[in-house]
């Protein structure tokens, strides 16, 4: 029997390399049984996660799962950092693992760093 708890499917220590100026959608996959929970995004600042109030978000519904999407239109350099989604379910707060965005400043397409190059530069986060 499947659990009817809300589940947030962001992988632990997941990472994305993205380019400033591009659009990007950060997805929080949400599994629930009956009523869709209230979901929010926050950005980590040290050990505190600061709620993102005035950002464009949307829901995408699929057969077995829903996605709460944080839109970056476009990505800005200060979007660099770690994000977490949270769901309120039966007065419980369920938090996802954090996911990290590494933002590279705009370059010509030929100079875009590869994912391999990005992965070797976690200092971009700071």
């Amino acid at each position: 029997k499947e659990s009817c708890d809300v589940q947030l499917y962001i992988k632990r220590q997941s990472e994305h390399s993205i380019l400033a100026g591009d659009p990007f959608e950060l997805e929080c996959p949400v599994k629930y049984c009956a009523n869709r929970p209230h979901v929010t995004w926050c950005k980590l600042n040290g050990t505190t996660c600061v709620k993102l109030e005035d950002r464009q978000t949307s829901w995408k519904e699929e057969k077995n799962i829903s996605f709460f999407i944080l839109h970056f239109e476009p990505v800005l350099p200060n979007d660099n950092g770690s994000y977490r989604c949270s769901a309120n379910f039966q007065s419980n707060l369920i938090e996802s693992h954090s996911t990290t965005l590494y933002v590279t400043d705009v370059k010509s397409a030929s100079e875009r760093p590869s994912k391999d190059e990005m992965a070797s530069r976690p200092w971009l986060l700071y």
Partner: antibody, heavy 119, light 112 residues
């Protein structure tokens, strides 16, 4: 049941390149991380790096950075390890493994690929 | 990078005896999510490694309950309560808290 099957043993000459594969089944690999480990003859285990098959993002051990390339094709549930400019010291057993990205509830290893580099 | 130091390097026991292997980390393995990502692997000659224990003390499916893991922070222990003939192998601890992932150097469990 989660399973990994690696490509067969390889014998190469110094300076050559090699790409070994690791095919997963029994799981949606977008929900996992896949990683590679080296074991030189009679020695311990060394973590090479990992890939997130969902987006191709890689992490390498500093010891292997620039020497190897990890890639994946999620459409065929397969991860790859490319070794370039092979040296005799690259002779080893190379293992791939896969684990659950959310809860680490499973961690399954392939059977290993023996790579021999000899002139 | 995190250094994991296992002791002893070789452990000689007779079947039926208790075996205890230690793994010490150069820094805490407690992650920001409150979990400790310390695993134990078993490797038999000519075979691939197999995970026995994850998150310090959780046994993998099919792992006999004579295997147990304990510890916190920087000090961890794998205990085999009564060693069976099929348990003679090399055991590795490894951490999944920080990058790069690192392994202990291994402990060979041999027949006394």
């Amino acid at each position: 049941e989660v399973q990994l099957v690696q490509s067969g043993a390889e014998v190469k000459k110094p300076g050559e390149s090699l790409k070994i594969s690791c095919k997963g089944s029994g799981v949606n690999i977008k929900d996992t991380y896949m990683y590679w480990v080296r074991q030189m003859p009679g020695k311990g285990l060394e973590w090479i790096g990992r890939i997130d098959p969902a987006n191709g993002y890689t992490r390498y051990s500093p010891s292997f950075q620039g020497q190897v390339t990890i890639s994946a094709d999620k459409s065929i549930s397969t991860a790859y390890l490319q070794l370039s400019s092979l040296k005799a010291s690259d002779t080893a057993m190379y293992y791939c493994a896969v684990y659950d990205g959310y809860y680490e509830s499973f961690d399954v290893w392939g059977q290993g690929t023996l790579v021999t580099v000899s002139s | 990078e995190i250094v994991l130091t296992q002791s002893p390097g070789t452990l000689s026991v007779s079947p039926g005896e208790r075996a205890t292997i230690s793994c010490r980390s150069s820094q805490s393995l407690l992650d920001s999510d409150g979990k400790t990502y310390l695993n134990w692997l078993q490797q038999k000659p000519g075979q691939a490694p197999r995970r026995l224990i994850y998150l310090v003390s959780k046994r993998d499916t099919g792992v006999p309950d004579r295997f147990s893991g304990s510890g916190s922070g920087t000090d961890f222990t794998l205990t085999i309560s009564r060693v069976e003939p099929e348990d003679f192998a090399v055991y590795y601890c490894w951490q999944g808290t920080l990058f790069p992932r690192t392994f202990g150097q291994g402990t060979k469990l041999e027949i006394k």
